[in-house]
């Protein structure tokens, strides 16, 4: 499956909208940083099936979607923001599910590629937790959304290293 | 085939330091969490601490938190809970546990070891 | 700590009944409620996670409902292999915390 054009357009227009929904410098929260354990290996081309990272893709956008649907999410950040930010995120999760049942077959991708899944979902509950722990604070939002962007840059750059190897 | 293999039955006097542990095997090592669940003979079941075997990263129960610690060793798939200093009151069947992870990020526990038994007495 | 109660602490039935177990917990957990069986001198295995998804495996005569505060367990048409005692989990906020168990046992 040749990932459109489009996709890679979409997570960049993504990566600007978490970007201009930062409300409070990163500089007055980095007491609240944290390493939330990236799965990078996951999302590791040269390692992985294209499947694979495919798969890790659509998880780690559909957990981005989780986290910035809740209503702790809401009062966090800019409502038109946010709405476009979910726009973008949504056409992606189409966009890599019919990627993902071309490559193999929906049931098959996920017993395929459950680790990888499950890689994603630990990152992401360590993320949920940290925020439980600082009581959705504006710094661990602002933290959270460094991390996102930073992940998200991660996985752009991978896609295109996908799309060069077809 | 998913398995989760503890150590047999351990007699200790109190004040000895102590480790168990949980071999696992048939899926992929750090993929999952695994906690460690308490039984005291005749009553129920306490969870104890969890730990993410591709970095080691543990959340623990605040009743537990000192008294206990967990580790794993990832070249040989094994789970380790470890006293410095047991006391009677740590008698009891000690299960390792695999976790499940859902996409509403749900962790429930779907894989149990046989359980060991520690019995603490002077 | 969230506290989960089970009611009722012990039951007695028949091969062929159908009993009820139900779970409480001192605040909203969602529908992160998850049941086991422990069969005597055995691990616990897992029946239903989520309040109402069916372990792999485990037989259509379980079933889990309920999600917020209050869960059930129904076991229909129970078999020789049910006469255990069951327990309740959430795993919603830390720490994880039980019921402290039903023993179904033969009337």
């Known amino acids: 499956c040749d990932l459109p054009q489009t996709h890679s357009l979409g997570n960049r227009r993504a990566l600007i909208l978490l970007a201009q929904m930062g409300r409070i410098s990163h500089f007055s929260c980095l007491k609240d940083r944290y390493d939330f354990g990236f799965p990078q290996e996951v999302f590791d081309g040269n390692q992985f099936q294209k499947a694979q990272a495919i798969s890790a893709f659509h998880e780690m956008i559909q957990q981005t979607f989780n986290l910035f649907s809740t209503k702790d999410s809401s009062a966090a950040w800019d409502e038109t923001l946010l709405d476009k930010f979910y726009i973008e995120l949504f056409q992606q999760l189409n966009d890599l599910e019919a990627c993902v049942t071309q490559e193999v077959g929906v049931e098959e991708i996920a017993l395929m590629n459950e680790d990888s899944i499950l890689a994603v979902r630990k990152y992401f509950q360590r993320i949920t937790l940290y925020l439980m722990g600082k009581k959705y604070s504006p710094c661990a939002w602002e933290v959270v959304r460094a991390e996102i962007m930073r992940s998200f840059s991660f996985s752009t750059n991978l896609q295109k290293g996908l799309r060069r190897k077809d | 085939e998913v398995q989760l293999v503890q150590a047999g039955a351990e007699v200790k006097a109190p004040g000895e330091s102590l480790r168990i542990s949980c071999k696992v095997s048939g899926y992929t090592f750090t993929s999952y969490w695994i906690s460690w669940v308490r039984q005291i003979p005749g009553k129920g079941l306490e969870w104890m601490v969890k730990i993410d075997p591709r970095d080691s990263y543990t959340i623990y129960n605040p009743s537990f938190q000192g008294h206990v610690s967990i580790s794993v060793d990832k070249s040989i798939t094994t789970v380790y809970l470890q006293w410095s200093s047991l006391q009677a009151s740590d008698t009891a069947i000690y299960y390792c546990?695999?976790?499940?992870?859902?996409?509403?990020?749900?962790?429930?526990?779907?894989?149990w070891g046989q359980g060991t038994l520690v019995a603490v007495s002077s | 700590d969230i506290q989960m109660t089970q009611s009722p602490s012990s039951l007695s039935a028949s091969v062929g009944d159908s009993v009820t177990i139900t779970c409480r917990a001192s605040?909203?957990?969602?529908?992160?409620f998850h049941w086991y069986r422990q069969k005597p001198g055995k691990a616990p295995e897992l029946l239903i996670y989520s309040a109402s998804n069916l372990q792999t495996g485990v037989p259509s005569r379980f079933t889990g409902s309920g999600s917020g505060t209050e869960c059930t367990l129904t076991i229909t048409s129970l078999q020789p292999d049910d006469f255990a005692t069951y327990y309740c989990q959430q795993t919603h906020g830390y720490p994880f915390t039980f019921g402290q168990g039903t023993k179904l046992d033969v009337r």
């Open positions: 605040q909203s957990v969602s529908n992160y």
């Open positions: 546990v695999r976790h499940y992870l859902t996409q509403s990020l749900v962790d429930y526990f779907d894989h």
